[in-house]
């Protein structure tokens, strides 16, 4: 799924977070001039992925891939083969459905977030994983952390690398 | 994950049990000359999977896949691509970690069984499901049933089909 065609730096950060790759995360955050509090916030999210094991990262990668390749994000109907799956969004801007998902992941209730993921016909096990990650993030992150994460996302969305 | 390369008849029985497929279970058990009490024991385990619904079967399949493809069961470090993930165990013998898990499922306490599954970085939701199944098996099976299940497992492990 060539999601990077829309906003490469966003997907760099997401996959660095989701895969628990701290070095890659640091490199990606340096590119968008992340502050120290913004880095701390992202590392707290990364901790949740790491603590919930490999399967958690696989499943949440599936959530991002599913939303990014959904009709909400695609300019035209996609072909069924994964190889042919391309994002034909307008320009390189991040898809609103992805933005909404990330927003709810940080500021919504567990129910609101999971319900949004559920719209994309995700498997029950994917939804349960999404809820676990959301609960973890709510437990780990203060309101200040969440504000820092949102301000970092704004930097990402408005970055020339997006 | 080509688990069937290690002990095909074991995985045949496991997936027949977990998927609630009574016909497939009967066929697999006939191959290892299971006695009537051994069949009864396996059907009690199968009932637990059936009663707990599809998600239970998916999640427990995930447990088996996770353990079977873990470092404890792999002869060498796996490559990162899912396509290249193969089980390079010694010969066709069942992996000791899988044996231990099945053993604890029958003879251990719920805590012991879930703690063993937890070593494989399973999601909390997977662990909860594992406990539900374990509790169900403990409630449904007599000591005699468990002994019969263990004797059947011995037949499976020593079968030429393993």
């Amino acid at each position: 799924v060539k999601m990077a065609e829309t906003c490469p730096i966003f997907y760099d950060v997401f996959f660095a977070v989701a895969n628990g790759n701290e070095l890659l995360l640091d490199l990606s955050l340096t590119k968008v001039n992340a502050t120290e509090p913004e880095r701390t916030a992202m590392k707290k999210i990364q901790d949740c992925y790491v603590e919930n094991g490999l399967i958690s990262r696989v499943l949440d990668g599936l959530v991002m891939t599913t939303i990014s390749s959904s009709k909400d994000c695609m300019g035209e109907a996609v072909q069924n083969t994964v190889e042919d799956l391309k994002l034909n969004t307008l320009g390189r801007e991040i898809c609103p459905a992805v933005k909404r998902g990330v927003d709810l992941f940080l500021t919504g209730t567990p129910d609101e977030y999971v319900e949004q993921v559920a719209q994309y016909k995700a498997l029950p096990v994917v939804l349960e994983n999404a809820r676990i990650l959301k609960n973890c993030v709510d437990a780990k992150m203060t309101e200040e952390d969440k504000e820092n994460a949102l301000s970092l996302l704004d930097k990402i969305y408005t970055s020339p690398l997006c | 994950v080509k688990m069937a390369e290690t002990c095909p008849i074991f995985y045949d029985v496991f997936f027949a049990v977990a998927n609630g497929n009574e016909l497939l279970l009967d066929l697999s058990l006939t191959k290892v000359n299971a006695t009537e009490p051994e069949r009864t024991a396996m059907k009690k385990i199968q009932d637990c999977y059936v009663e707990n619904g599809l998600i239970s079967r998916v999640l427990d399949g995930l447990v088996m896949t996770t353990i079977s493809s873990s470092k404890d069961c792999m002869g060498e470090a796996v490559q990162n691509t899912v396509e290249d993930l193969k089980l390079n165990t010694l010969g066709r013998e069942i992996c000791p970690a899988v044996k231990r898990g099945v053993d604890l499922f029958l003879t251990g306490t719920p805590d012991e069984y879930v703690e063993q599954v937890a070593q494989y970085k399973a999601l909390p939701v997977v662990l909860e499901n594992a406990r539900i199944l374990k509790n169900c098996v403990d409630a449904k099976m007599t000591e005699e049933d468990k002994e019969n299940a263990l004797s059947l497992l011995d037949k499976i492990y020593t079968s030429p089909l393993c």
């Epitope: 809820r131 437990a139 | 909390p124 662990l127």
Partner: antibody, heavy 123, light 107 residues
């Protein structure tokens, strides 16, 4: 088998502090999240706080946030609840409870409970 | 916080009766619901988790069902040992909340 024994309860004046302990045995303590749950006399149950298996995350009910601190000592199989600025409404039996499922991120399902220790806040 | 409301508050029944206790959540908690039994002067005991999963050692006469906002605990044939107070608890978030309890007493 799993045994949880609370101690440290007693009568204390409003505004004062108290520290509760819970000694655990019969399970791999360092693998489980631990909780405090309380019950006011004749009332229902109220969750108070959780500490994750490795002590990395602590989470509190709004009613005690900023006043109570949960901690654990994995080498001694013990959890603690430091209660400061106590109020009359904190009067309750305090139970220590073990999470049902091991490791991080587990749901707050209370699989095993201690017998409780009574805290009375009164002048 | 999510509010949990149980009904009835008190229930009078006889040995052998089928008993049903209802628990309602102020918002959806999916299937993340547990039930506990508490006897006077004792700690609560976990009966059911994830709506219908029976905890170890709990008799099959106890069963749970429901999803979203409405849940039930059923005791198929009430036994003398079952007279107690029952609590539901949601764990959809890291701020778990309990129902106010249902006391099952002898008729």
């Amino acid at each position: 088998q799993v045994v949880l024994v609370e101690s440290g309860g007693g009568v204390v004046q409003p505004g004062r502090s108290l520290r509760l302990s819970c000694a655990a045995s019969g399970f791999t303590f360092s693998s489980y999240g631990m909780h405090w749950v309380r019950q006011a006399p004749g009332k229902g149950l109220e969750w108070v706080a959780v500490i994750w298996y490795d002590g990395s995350i602590k989470y509190y009910a709004d009613s005690v946030k900023g006043r109570f601190t949960i901690s654990r000592d994995n080498s001694n199989n013990t959890i603690y609840l430091q209660m400061n600025s106590l109020r009359a409404e904190d009067t309750a039996v305090y139970y220590c409870a073990r999470a049902l499922i091991p490791v991080a991120g587990t749901d707050p399902i209370f699989g095993y409970w201690g017998q409780g220790t009574l805290v009375t806040v009164s002048s | 916080d999510i509010q949990m409301t149980q009904s009835p508050s008190t229930l009078s029944a006889s040995v052998g009766d089928r008993v049903t206790i209802t628990c309602r959540a102020s918002q959806s908690v999916s299937s993340w619901l547990a039930w506990y039994q508490q006897k006077p002067g004792k700690a609560p005991k976990l009966l059911i988790f994830k709506t219908s999963g029976l905890e170890s050692g709990v008799p099959f006469r106890f069963s749970g069902s429901g999803s979203g906002t409405e849940f039930t605990l059923t005791i198929s044939s009430l036994q003398p040992d079952d007279f107690a107070t029952y609590y539901c608890q949601q764990y959809n978030t890291y701020s778990p909340t309990f129902g106010q309890g249902t006391k099952v007493e002898i008729k």
